[in-house]
Structure formats: C-alpha cells, structure tokens
C-alpha cells in the first residue's frame, strides 16, 4: 500500500480501467451471444 | 533518502544513463519522479515511473528519455544529448499523504558540449 | 500537457510584509497542486500539497488557496530566510495531463 498522493489518484485510476474493461468484455460477450442465437 | 549519480561532461548525441539509488522506502510503494534545472533557469518535469513501473512523460521529453527501475534504483537515460539538456537533474519520491512530505537527492549535473 | 503560468517572475518586499504568488493552470485541475521552495544550490522543498494543505514542518506563515485553475501562494510576516524561489506544480491525472511545474517566482526579502 502507498500513501503517495500521486500513486493513490492513479491507483484508482487503474481500478478504473480494469472495470471498463470486464464491462466491455462481458458485453461484448452477451452481444456476440445474442448474434449467435438470432 | 535519493542520491542521484552519473552525471558528467558528454558529447552531443552520446547516450547517457543517470541513476537514483533509494533506501528506507519501497519503489514498490512510491512513484518516482525526474525533474531537471538548466543554469539560473526553472524547474522542469520530465516523466513518472509508477510502484507498478508504468512511465509517463512530458510532451517534449518523449523519445528523448526512458525511465525505468530495478528495487532500489531509478534510471534516466537521456538517448541523445543536446546542449539544450545541459541541466543538474533531479530525482525525488513523490509526496506522501501521512507523512506530508517528499524526498529529493541534491541532483547531479549533466554538461553537453562538444 | 496542462501549462502551469505563475505570476509575478519577481517581487520584493520587506521584513515582516506580505507576498502573493498567483499560479494559473490552462484547465481545470481541481486542487491538484503542490508548492514548492527552492533556495540556491539546493533541491525544491516541498511547501503545501492538495492546493492547500501544509507539508511536515512547514511554518503557517505559507498559505495555499484556490482551485480548479487559480491558485494561490501567500506568506505573510516575511523573513529573510522566505528569500528563494517558489514554484508551483500540478499533479492531476498526470499518465494524460503532465505534471508541470509554473515558470517560477524570485521572492527578495529586503
């Protein structure tokens, strides 16, 4: 863990991205799903 | 502490590496900066290493430097000097909430010059 | 990258006066901001972060204000020792914005 005040605004950041990024995995996923079933 | 090392007298277009040997913090906790001063003038950002080791840098200084780290020391390496980068450069650790401060080592000097 | 301009380059005031320094960032960034001193022949010390809240060991004398794209460095009861050079830095989203610091102000204490 840090204490950093830049490492803390980047760290959540980070956390960030890693959201938008599951996100746009899961549907994505869900997307190409229905794609499939029509 | 942060004792910056490595900088000298070099011709223009040699690459030079400066380094920054840390001690009683983690790399792996902080974010590193590099800060240069050219004679009688301002301070100036270069780039960021992040506890992660992502880097980022200031518009003018990309492709002209590269930061990168090991556990306990930074590295600076200047690609290809111009006079233009005739500076005393500076690593410090970036600010801590709790402890309100930062840590900066007295800087080393780099001379370009043919 | 966001440009940090700091205001006045110099001024000059006597012992026990006052002294504002102005720092203007070119976009908003919050209280995004450090303060620094730096005396010659020696590295910047860390003054006040956030915009406004005093590092370790720092006197009250140093105040920061503003936000967004104004700030403001004040110190008040000036001594001698306060001669140096002030600068300001921004730290907002730096991985995309930098971290620029202002071009610097010369404080004399008379």
């Known amino acids: 863990h840090s204490d950093g005040i830049f490492t803390d605004s980047y760290s959540r950041y980070r956390k960030q991205m890693a959201v938008k990024k599951y996100l746009a995995a899961v549907l994505g996923k869900r997307y190409k799903q229905r794609v499939k079933n029509k | 502490s942060v004792e910056e090392s490595g900088g000298r007298l070099v011709t223009p277009g040699t690459p030079l590496t400066l380094t920054c040997t840390v001690s009683?913090?983690?790399?792996?906790?902080?974010?590193m900066i590099w800060v240069r001063q050219a004679p009688g003038k301002g301070l100036e950002w270069i780039g960021i290493?992040?506890?992660?080791?992502d880097t980022y840098y200031a518009s003018w200084a990309k492709g002209r430097f590269t930061i990168s780290k090991t556990s306990t020391t930074v590295y600076l390496k200047i690609a290809s000097p111009t006079t233009e980068d005739t500076a005393t450069y500076f690593c410090?650790?970036?600010?801590?909430?709790?402890?309100?401060?930062?840590?900066w080592g007295q800087g080393t000097l780099v001379t370009v010059s043919s | 990258d966001v440009v940090m301009t700091q205001t006045p380059a110099s001024v000059s005031e006597p012992v026990g006066g006052t002294v504002t320094i102005k720092c203007q960032a070119s976009e908003n960034i919050y209280n995004s901001l450090l303060w620094y001193q730096q005396k010659p022949g020696q590295p910047p010390k860390l003054l006040i972060y956030r915009a406004s809240t005093l590092a370790s060991g720092v006197s009250s004398r140093f105040k920061g204000s503003g936000s967004g794209t104004e700030f403001t460095l004040t110190i008040s009861d000036l001594e001698c020792a306060d001669a140096a050079t002030y600068y300001c830095q921004n730290y907002y989203n730096i991985w995309t914005n930098g971290a620029a610091f202002g071009g610097g102000t010369e404080v004399v204490v008379k």
């Open positions: 290493i992040y506890d992660n080791g």
């Open positions: 410090a650790r970036e600010p801590g909430s709790t402890t309100q401060n930062d840590l």
């Open positions: 009683g913090f983690s790399l792996s906790s902080y974010a």
